[in-house]
Amino acid sequence: ESLGWDIAELQLNHTGPQQDPRLYWQGGPALGRSFLRGPELDKGQLRIRRDGIYMVHIQVTLAICSSTSTSRHHHPTTLAVGICSPASRSISLLRLSFHQGCTIASQRLTPLARGDTLCTNLTGTLLPSRNTDETFFGVQWVRP
Amino acid sequence: ESLGWDIAELQLNHTGPQQDPRLYWQGGPALGRSFLRGPELDKGQLRIRRDGIYMVHIQVTLAICSSTSTSRHHHPTTLAVGICSPASRSISLLRLSFHQGCTIASQRLTPLARGDTLCTNLTGTLLPSRNTDETFFGVQWVRP
Amino acid sequence: ESLGWDIAELQLNHTGPQQDPRLYWQGGPALGRSFLRGPELDKGQLRIRRDGIYMVHIQVTLAICSSTSTSRHHHPTTLAVGICSPASRSISLLRLSFHQGCTIASQRLTPLARGDTLCTNLTGTLLPSRNTDETFFGVQWVRP
């Protein structure tokens, strides 16, 4: 672990209450193929424990969705990954809208610091799939 | 190689016969920019030779496709990447549907073990593009 | 740096003049969360300084876009990442069309050599978003 190979891959636990757009994540071998090796979960949000540049990746699929599902709903469904705390470092890192699709997937390199908590905000009114091969979120430390 | 930097990037060779949804891959410098350094191909399917956590990524583009192509076909076109053998470890790792798009692309971190064979199943009735910049599949060992 | 951990994450600076489909990138801590550690920018294009296999990733979002925006325009909007110089190594590495979506995102492993300059060509008549969480381009050296 001292090599700094911090890494995590999480699966969706649940969505937040109505006014909370955050997705709540879980990880661990008992749950399937998700794991946390270095980073930790704080009330379902991912907290970084080692400074460095990370590859952050995410895929979110909307539940029982067809290409017409997303157009039925007025408010566009958008997924944003960002640093939500500490407040002084709050920033959106990655943002995607579903438009007429049912899945978004992306990845990016970004510097993260010990104590940064990442939030994944799903705005709109569609429930995400909890299937572990359709919705997942992970980070990988790649260099100091 | 002893560092465990197993890595592969493959290009599409061909699709399977009618009842076989698997894509068959090929790799090697003679073919272009594809390569296998550690993992190997077994009848067009990628076999892992070193235990560890891997970043698996894929992009598949449907051939001669427009946004109406995918909506014309009744059965949704879906791509699933999974461990198909050994049977005891069979699981779907990553799944995406095309809906009204012509390309899917995603990536995830997942633990893989020596001997795991990865299959990429394309269900539906649309042929994938064999262009090497449109359809590719790869894995990268990232840590033990 | 001698470890070969070359890495870069860039944000969009501007598009080219009318006959130039290339996107022009910028990076550096003063600009936000973009950075260059090893690779360098040459007139807004990314130049590789170390041989190896790289993970190349990109996300491009079209500006003020809805799912109907892309279908309104006759020429499909396509993003291609390739080696544009030296001319002897010119090749398309990764290509995606927007179809009825507003964002493309993908990644791939590819061998790159010192001196390779990567270009990202956006064909079509739609402007990309310059928001740093919507449009970005990066490379990460992963092994020799």
Partner: antibody, heavy 120, light 111 residues
């Protein structure tokens, strides 16, 4: 608080049309979908259709040829119209709100119901 | 369309005891990591009231003596301990696909 108030006739002549208005309060039709369901002794609860927040509609295939649902967001009203009623359309007709999650397709608040008899 | 079959059609349960109502779907209503089954209570002269959504989630304001379980095709609504005000007809409803359909109802009488 959330309320759905229905207004419409109790008696409809055979082959005539049924129109019901559902006036909502405590929520916005630009955010929530509204379903229509009917209940009869013979057929129990039957889902008829829904109008989504966008104004897009989905109908039960069994009623698609004679059912129309529309709305006026500014007046917080949803309009239900069914043509060519016959005696087996005699039922209580309800409007009901879809919960916050659009793909849940459940009904968390209901109107009081409009009892409709089809008879000459 | 998915057909939902409820059983029993009616039952009588003593005050304070457990009432168990079953609902069987003609095909699985589980998808995307959720179970798309909901339960309603309807009292005479009133509209149905949502009790349970997604098989096991208690709707806000519903007493904790109501609970739902099941996945795939077989579902159960439990009420324990039964109170007098629970006398009503209970319906299951799926939303796995359009059209949503309802079960035929189970009438609960309190002894």
């Amino acid at each position: 608080q959330v309320q759905l108030q229905q207004s419409g006739p109790g008696l409809v002549q055979p082959s005539q049309s049924l129109s019901i208005t559902c006036t909502v309060s405590g929520f916005s039709l630009t955010t929530y979908a509204v379903h229509w369901v009917r209940q009869s002794p013979g057929k129990g609860l039957e889902w008829l259709g829904v109008i989504w927040s966008t104004g897009i509609t989905d109908y039960n295939a069994a009623f698609i040829s004679r059912l129309s649902i529309s709305k006026d967001n500014s007046k917080s009203q949803v309009f239900f119209k069914m043509d060519s009623l016959q005696s087996d359309d005699t039922a209580i007709y309800f409007c009901a709100r879809n919960p916050h999650y659009g793909n849940l397709n459940a009904m968390d608040y209901w109107g009081q119901g409009t009892s409709v008899t089809v008879s000459s | 369309d998915i057909v939902l079959t409820q059983s029993p059609a009616s039952l009588a349960v003593s005050l304070g005891q457990r009432a168990t109502i079953s609902c069987r779907a003609s095909k699985s209503v589980s998808a995307s990591g959720y179970t798309w089954m909901h339960w309603y209570q309807q009292k005479p002269g009133q509209a149905p009231k949502l009790l349970i959504y997604l098989a096991s989630n208690l709707e806000s304001g519903v007493p904790a003596r109501f609970s739902g379980s099941g996945s795939g095709t077989d579902f159960t609504l439990n009420i324990h301990p039964v109170e007098e005000e629970d006398a009503a007809t209970y319906y299951c409803q799926h939303s796995r696909e359009l059209p949503p359909t309802f079960g035929g109802g189970t009438k609960l009488e309190i002894k």
